[in-house]
């Protein structure tokens, strides 16, 4: 009979064991264990009848298709075998054990005691067959095993081979190299690789296989296992395999698909190819006259670009547009994207107008092209070029007029100062009062009219000032101070100030330049109690044009001593001859109390100590500070008066041969103007030179060339 055993271990004994087994007996034990296990069988006791080749009694161990062992007897002989210490191992998970006794036993035989157990199969060690073994890594466990793959590989659905994901390779560069995965190592199994070369339309892909070419093949059937196919539009080239690479392929297309297929077996090294884009050739190019083409090549193909540039002093001209460079491109149809432009000489065009200046052309026909030369000059004698610049400008390669020092900036024509169009008389008779000034004698003289319309009725007064530049007037702070204040110093609104320049006769303002104020700047330390720091500036709304009747006066050098005692200076003004008259009467045309024609007087500088003493001897709190100086005569008769305030006291500077403003008419009194021993007090301008330049926003160096040393 047959006994089915399914346990992982067990014991098998001969019938009647440990008594002797019966005759004519046959028992089969079928042992089945799970897959991944084999069966190990060994005997603890064995005693059967001996016979030649175990013909009588025996124990036979077998699998489905193979006898593993036949045992009988008590001890092994040449013709019979006992198990002894031998272990029987099934190749698979099934083992069949058959016990048989014949009809007669000459003596009593005790039979056998056997044990079996399921033992794990180490598939990783034992699988020799490539068809079954793991492609990369094998991992054994009790009852089974599994496979895994190297980095970058994926386990195939057969759970054994390792493939790669290589179906998404896009190449868009004009040249490139494509290889089988892992090249030059063997390519992965069970893979479907797809390589797409997609170039811009107009290019054609050329393929060339290089180095090793090794794809599994078959001696009879063309490429049944692994292969390359090349798809160009509807056309398919290949399959290719074996060890001989295909010849270079000119696809005549900008789009190519390369398919590579590998099956689940084989160890081949794969392939490598390079591809290159080819384009249509464009015609040869000739550089323009006075120009060049970069890069310079014998041949140009689709997508090649060239840059056309011109020699120094020339500009690329394309469709009447000037440019520095022009780029053209070889198109897919083998034509150039544009015609070669021409090179045109750079033209700086008409040079910029110079305020208060003139332009002369050094080159014939007033040429304004590259390397042409012009010369700027200032309107002399009223303006002089700053820093004694040459004024020479050359047309540069960039198309701009360039000066060696100033670059593309225009020169500056600075007003000349202290040089009247008429020379001032060197001697003035010591007469009582002043005399009429000829037009152009005091071209810096300004009449400042202040009309404060913010009060009802309006306040109106006037004073004098001195032109320092085309935009700035120097005057006394008390002229521009809001009059309705007792001790506080607040400037009048700029809207209330009008400045007249080039004025000779106040009855005829038609020839004068009148200007509004853009800014009114009082010295921050002006003291209304003692008139210390009595200096102010008016910035004009627009620069005034200079000419014979309108020219600035020079500022002095910074010297705390001020003008030397007994030096003679001139001061001009339309001041009041009768001090008891009101400004409204002065401004109205019917009165002669305001001098119609500009008056001037020559006065000597009074030693400081003498002036201080003359004022200290008076009742009242008079203070002649170091920021003031006095001028006039002990006996009186000549003086400045109301309405002259802010006017310039000028002294001729022998070094520079120019008239310099040393003082500003400030105060005097309390007696009438021109009284005996009543000196006029003037603001000492030389103490404020830095402050004046700072307010005007000009570096002091600007003025240095004007007052040569």
């Amino acid at each position: 009979h047959t006994v089915e055993l399914n346990n992982m271990f067990g014991q098998i004994q001969s019938p009647g064991y440990p008594d002797s087994y019966p005759s004519d007996s046959e028992v089969t034990w079928n042992i089945t264990v799970p897959d991944g296990f084999r069966i190990k069988l060994y005997f603890m006791h064995f005693n059967l009848e001996s016979s030649y080749l175990c013909e009588y009694d025996y124990v036979k161990v077998e699998t489905e298709d193979q006898v593993l062992a036949t045992f009988c007897g008590r001890e092994t002989t040449d013709t019979e075998q006992t198990p002894g210490q031998e272990v029987v191992l099934s190749p698979g998970s099934f083992m069949s054990i058959t016990f048989r006794s014949d009809f007669s036993n000459e003596e009593r035989f005790t039979g056998f005691d056997a044990h079996y157990m399921a033992v794990d199969v180490d598939e990783c060690k034992e699988r020799e067959d490539e068809e079954l073994s793991c492609d990369h890594y094998c991992h054994n466990y009790i009852g089974g095993y599994y496979c895994s793959c190297r980095f970058g590989y994926i386990l195939h659905t057969d759970n054994r081979t390792c493939r790669v994901e290589c179906s998404d390779n896009l190449f868009t560069q004009r040249t490139g190299v494509i290889t089988s995965p892992d090249f030059p190592n063997p390519y992965p199994k069970s893979s479907e690789c797809l390589y797409t070369i997609e170039l811009e339309e107009g290019f054609m892909v050329n393929l060339q296989f290089e180095d090793i070419f090794d794809i599994e093949d078959h001696p009879e059937v063309p490429c049944p296992y692994d292969y390359i196919k090349i798809k160009v539009g509807p056309k398919v080239l290949g399959p290719f395999c074996g060890e001989k690479a295909p010849e270079p392929i000119s696809t005549q297309s900008h789009s190519v698909l390369i398919l590579f297929h590998s099956d689940n077996s084989g160890e081949n090294r794969g392939w490598r190819l390079s591809y290159r884009a080819a384009g249509n050739e464009c015609p040869e190019l000739q550089p323009p006259v006075h120009g060049k083409i970069e890069p310079s090549q014998a041949k140009y193909f689709f997508k090649d670009q060239v840059l056309v540039s011109c020699d120094t002093g020339y500009k690329v001209l394309k469709d009447n547009v000037e440019m520095d460079t022009f780029q053209i491109e070889c198109l897919k149809d083998g034509t150039w994207s544009n015609k070669i432009p021409t090179c045109k000489i750079v033209d700086c065009r008409a040079p910029g107008e110079l305020e208060h200046g003139l332009i002369t052309f050094s080159t014939r026909n007033n040429l304004t092209t590259y390397k042409s030369e012009i010369k700027y000059s200032c309107q002399e004698p009223y303006y002089k070029m700053l820093n004694n610049n040459t004024g020479i400008y050359t047309c540069s390669a960039q198309g701009v007029w360039m000066n060696k020092v100033l670059g593309r900036s225009l020169p500056t024509c600075l007003p000349e100062c202290g040089q009247p169009s008429r020379s001032l008389p060197s001697l003035v008779k010591r007469i009582i009062g002043g005399r009429n000034a000829e037009p152009g004698l005091f071209p810096w003289q300004a009449l400042i009219v202040v009309e404060d319309t913010s009060r009802v009725p309006n306040d109106k007064w006037f004073g004098s000032g001195a032109l320092l530049s085309a935009s700035w007037i120097l005057t006394a702070a008390h002229v521009l101070r809001s009059q309705r204040r007792d001790t506080t110093v607040i400037p009048v609104s700029k809207e209330h100030v009008t400045v007249y320049l080039g004025l000779h006769d106040v009855r005829d303002k038609s020839g004068a330049v009148n200007s509004s104020a853009a800014r009114v700047v009082l010295h921050p330390d002006f003291n209304i109690q003692n008139y210390n720091h009595d200096i102010a500036l008016v910035q004009l709304q627009e620069p005034v044009p200079l000419g014979p009747h309108v020219m600035p006066v020079c500022l002095p050098r910074l010297e705390p001593e001020g003008p030397a005692p007994h030096m003679l200076g001139l001061v001009a003004g339309w001041g009041i001859s009768n001090p008891n008259v009101t400004v409204d009467e002065i401004i109205s045309s019917g009165t002669r109390t305001l001098s119609d024609v500009l008056q001037y007087v020559k006065l000597p500088v009074v030693p400081h100590a003498e002036c201080k003493t003359s004022y200290e001897s008076r009742s009242g709190n008079y203070s002649v500070t170091e920021n003031m100086f006095c001028a006039g005569y002990y006996e009186g008769g000549k003086d400045t008066c109301l309405g002259d305030s802010g006017g310039a006291f000028v002294i001729f500077d022998d070094l520079s041969q120019r008239w310099v403003v040393q003082g500003l008419v400030s105060w005097g009194g309390p007696e009438e103007c021109g009284s005996k021993q009543v000196y006029g007090v003037y603001t000492k301008v030389s103490n404020y030179v830095d402050w004046v330049w700072e307010q005007m926003g000009l570096p002091q160096s600007v003025v240095e060339p004007q007052v040569e040393r």
């Epitope: 913010s454 009060r455 306040d459 004073g463 309705r484 009101t582 305030s645």
Partner: antibody, heavy 113, light 112 residues
Framework: QVQLVQSGAEVKKPGASVKVSCKAS????????IEWVRQAPGQGLEWIGE????????DYNERFKDRATFTADTSTSTAYMELSSLRSEDTAVYYC??????WGQGTLVTVSS | DIVLTQSPDSLAVSLGERATINCKSS????????????LAWFQQKPGQSPKLLIY???TRESGVPDRFSGSGSGTDFTLTISSLQAEDVAVYYC????????FGGGTKVEIK
Amino acid sequence: QVQLVQSGAEVKKPGASVKVSCKASGYTFTGKWIEWVRQAPGQGLEWIGEILPGSGSTDYNERFKDRATFTADTSTSTAYMELSSLRSEDTAVYYCVRSEDLWGQGTLVTVSS
Amino acid sequence: DIVLTQSPDSLAVSLGERATINCKSSQNLFNSRTRKNYLAWFQQKPGQSPKLLIYWASTRESGVPDRFSGSGSGTDFTLTISSLQAEDVAVYYCKQSYIPFTFGGGTKVEIK
């Protein structure tokens, strides 16, 4: 015609603030100073300060510097005077004046608890 | 601040008679630059706003009767009503126009 029209009478509690308005017409409001003057019942005139509407410049009588604020709205040609921390002695008629010829009709401000 | 002292405090004058009001300043009000005295005179009738009569010490405002005149310079100023009319009954104030502006205490003019 040229005139200054002031806001109506106000009654305020001590410690409160009052804002009196003065609307100008008939001249260029921005270019002339507006003064503020007050007159306590049966008393003389007292100058509070002034504003130039175009620039916003102001001058204050020291006595009122901490409590009075002048403003001007040029779009409506209206000047304002605000007086804070009111006390009973601030009871007065407050005038705005175009410096210095044209007077408003006055605004009575009564400060009473 | 400049202090203005008006005198007398009140004045009773017969109709057609001259009325004189004085105003003394603690500081000189003459401005040598504009050659003006910054002093004005105002008239305030009962229940009305003040009205400008004289500015710059002596200039009559337009529309003001010529019986009103101003004089003086520096620190001493006078308002004169040459022939008092019934409509001239009012309080008269002087005002100086250096900031901060100040007013005199006022002079009440009545008919005797």
